[in-house]
């Protein structure tokens, strides 16, 4: 009997009530694979949804969002209201982007302007609610008298290779440490052994925390109201 059902093609179902005959899917239903015992109900595109592809006996309907809305989720399972550029959708509706943020689309959230200084650049064009800032050349490049061409790398002075500089720095550090320990050694004569032990231990002792510090952070941030902008 199972073999009979497996012969039923897509667009039909294996009808148990009719000796497992392959019956066509009834209106507004479909089966996308063969051997199905039931047909699935077609998706209905209603309300904010509009039909992109009609349902057939072998495939489900596909929906899109009506004008003023955009799809969210797999296979456009949700429609979200558009906002204008320079706005974002919050719990209270479409709100303008706060200063320092922008949104160049009708969907999504407001994002912070690019911080040009992080890349060592300057702001060429100021940002708006709808547009990000445009970063230009670094402030140093804009200083008077600076040529637009890249200056040649300065020639290294003879006798100052990185290896020599590193060796001199290392030698100086070792000498300083030796001097430090010699001074401490002589101080043993003047001070007791216990006192010297205290000197060594002191920097590594963990200070006792106050209750407030153990709490983590003492300052509490006020609850931000959705859609409000910080001044």
């Amino acid at each position: 009997l199972q073999d009979l059902c497996s012969n039923c093609p897509a667009g039909t179902f294996c009808d148990n009530n009719r000796s497992q005959i392959c019956s066509p899917c009834p209106p507004n239903s479909f089966s996308s694979a063969g051997g199905q015992r039931t047909c699935d109900i077609c998706r209905q595109c209603k309300g904010v949804f509009k039909t992109r592809k009609e349902c057939s006996s072998t495939s489900n309907a596909e929906c899109d969002c009506i004008s003023g809305y955009h799809c969210l989720g797999a296979e456009c399972s949700m429609c979200e209201q558009d906002c204008k550029q320079g706005q974002e959708l919050t719990k209270k509706g479409c709100k303008d982007c706060c200063f320092g943020t922008f949104n160049d689309q009708k969907r999504g959230i407001c994002r912070p302007w690019t911080n040009c200084s992080l890349d060592g650049k300057s702001v060429l064009v100021n940002g708006t609610k709808e547009r990000d800032v445009v970063c230009g050349p670094s402030p140093a490049d804009l200083s008077p008298g600076a040529s637009s061409a890249t200056p040649p790398a300065p020639a290294r002075e003879p006798g100052h290779s990185p290896q020599i500089i590193f060796f001199l720095a290392l030698t100086s550090t070792v000498v300083l440490f030796l001097l430090f320990f010699l001074v401490l050694r002589f101080s043993v004569v003047k001070r007791s052994r216990k006192k010297l032990l205290y000197i060594f231990k002191q920097p590594f002792m963990r200070p006792v925390q106050t209750t407030q510090e153990e709490d983590g952070c003492s300052c509490r941030f006020p609850e931000e109201e959705e859609g409000g902008c910080e001044l």
Partner: nanobody
Framework: EVQLVESGGGLVQPGGSLRLSCAAS????????MSWARQAPGKGLEWVSG???????YYTESVKDRFTISRDNAKNTLYLQMNSLRPEDTAVYYC????????????????WGQGTLVTVSS
């Protein structure tokens, strides 16, 4: 079968009031979030207001302080009290389930009524 039937629309003068009703059947109304949407002539569909099963209410900016959404779970009915009506409130008003609980967002499983026309004109 899920059914949502709106009523209460009609012609009203600017500054006037109307109360829309939406009779729900075929699902557990008391545990469902509900919403109102509207479509002005030649314009797109606009999310107007929503109410959670627990009673929390949400409104679009343009109707705040003028419209009030409410529900009567015993009667399986959703209401929209509209006061200080303006000509720009003229639209077909739809009642819909609101499974996403998100402002301006509906899902494919949400159900819609056929709508009731509200005309604000002198």
């Amino acid at each position: 079968e899920v059914q949502l039937v709106e009523s209460g629309g009609g012609l009203v003068q600017p500054g006037g009031s109307l109360r829309l009703s939406c009779a729900a059947s075929g699902f557990t109304f008391s545990s469902s979030a509900m919403s109102w949407a509207r479509q002005a002539p030649g314009k797109g569909l606009e999310w107007v207001s929503g109410i959670y099963s627990g009673g929390s209410t949400y409104y679009t900016e343009s109707v705040k302080d003028r419209f009030t959404i409410s529900r009567d779970n015993a009667k399986n009915t959703l209401y929209l009290q509209m006061n200080s009506l303006r000509p720009e409130d003229t639209a077909v008003y739809y009642c819909a389930t609101w499974g996403t609980l998100r402002f301006g967002v509906w899902a494919e499983y949400d159900h819609w009524g056929q709508g009731t026309l509200v005309t604000v004109s002198s």
